[in-house]
Amino acid sequence: EVEKTACPSGKKAREIDESLIFYKKWELEACVDAALLATQMDRVNAIPFTYEQLDVLKHKLDELYPQGYPESVIQHLGYLFLKMSPEDIRKWNVTSLETLKALLEVNKGHEMSPQVATLIDRFVKGRGQLDKDTLDTLTAFYPGYLCSLSPEELSSVPPSSIWAVRPQDLDTCDPRQLDVLYPKARLAFQNMNGSEYFVKIQSFLGGAPTEDLKALSQQNVSMDLATFMKLRTDAVLPLTVAEVQKLLGPHVEGLKAEERHRPVRDWILRQRQDDLDTLGLGLQGGIPNGYLVLDLSMQEALS
């Protein structure tokens, strides 16, 4: 903290300008009026203050707004935002997307900092849901943003927002997250025709149930192996050899290279070897001829 000292004669700041970088910390404390600072925050970012000096300015704002800064100040914080703690940010009420963008811009091109994570959390909570414009903005700055949310948080994403999601935004999502996102995507894209629908839904298929995969197998979609490998194992297991062949189309040959990996490995174990042989890929490990297949999960459900 800077000691309270009187401002030297002639040094009282009439406006926030470049001359202030030549002020010592105690002079900034004594000579810069907090209300003036608040109304001219947009100028601070254009002045190369040291963070030591910015600490003094932050302290002045903290004293002026002990309950948290108003949005008119927040929007123009610029590099001073990088001096804010998550505790500071939790006091804010940020409702404007422009404010959010302005602060994300300061942190652009880098990992999400604790400050940014807190800011986004405050913003989304204030809005009540992740609307399309917000999601558009957040995924533009942080492609992995969606996958950083818990399944509970994802449940607040309206289906209309799914249109903003790009395939790369889902790269780090786990099955639990895709379980939540897939039904929303299905709803969002339901009015599209076959091939267009598949292009859009493809990234979300890690959350698709068996019946939807069966339906897709009837539509000549030619799913690539990378997508197939991300499908839920429990959704793939009930598919027949014929259904997988239709689902993958020409990509079915890729099964051989993946036969030791899930879900292909587990799926092979559930198929009759005779059926696997019809693919002509040399897949081994299926159920030998003459063996009876008991579906124990069905038996448990009945008992």
Partner: nanobody, 119 residues
């Protein structure tokens, strides 16, 4: 993060020197840059500064004689000093207003200083 200055030395009045400051390190970005100086028995004071947008600011005592510049590709800041005077004698420090992504906060980065003697 390290800022390393070079280019200081002994020069006659009216002479010129060019100071360089090379930034190295990972997980940080630089916003504003500046040169400060500290004469014997004095406090460190800003001489020239440059904002992230490229605007420059100079202390009255060096206006028209000193020029600050920045090469982003080389991560280097320069201070061209012409028409040097004995009162320019000081240790010159490179400064960067940066952001450390490991720490998660804005930080002040300083070089170790390079000595300039005009006599």
């Amino acid at each position: 993060v390290q800022l390393v200055e070079s280019g200081g030395g002994l020069v006659q009045p009216g002479g010129s020197l060019r100071l360089s400051c090379a930034a190295s390190g990972s997980m940080f970005s630089i916003n504003a840059v500046a040169w400060y100086r500290q004469a014997p028995g004095e406090q460190r004071e800003p001489v020239a500064a440059m904002t992230s947008g490229g605007s420059t600011i100079y202390a009255d005592s060096v206006k028209g004689r000193f020029t600050i510049s920045r090469d982003n590709a080389k991560n280097t800041v320069y201070l061209q000093m012409n028409s040097l005077k004995p009162e320019d004698t000081a240790v010159y420090y490179c400064y960067a207003q940066g952001y450390d992504y490991d720490e998660g906060y804005g930080m002040d980065y300083w070089g170790q200083g390079t000595s300039v003697t005009v006599s």
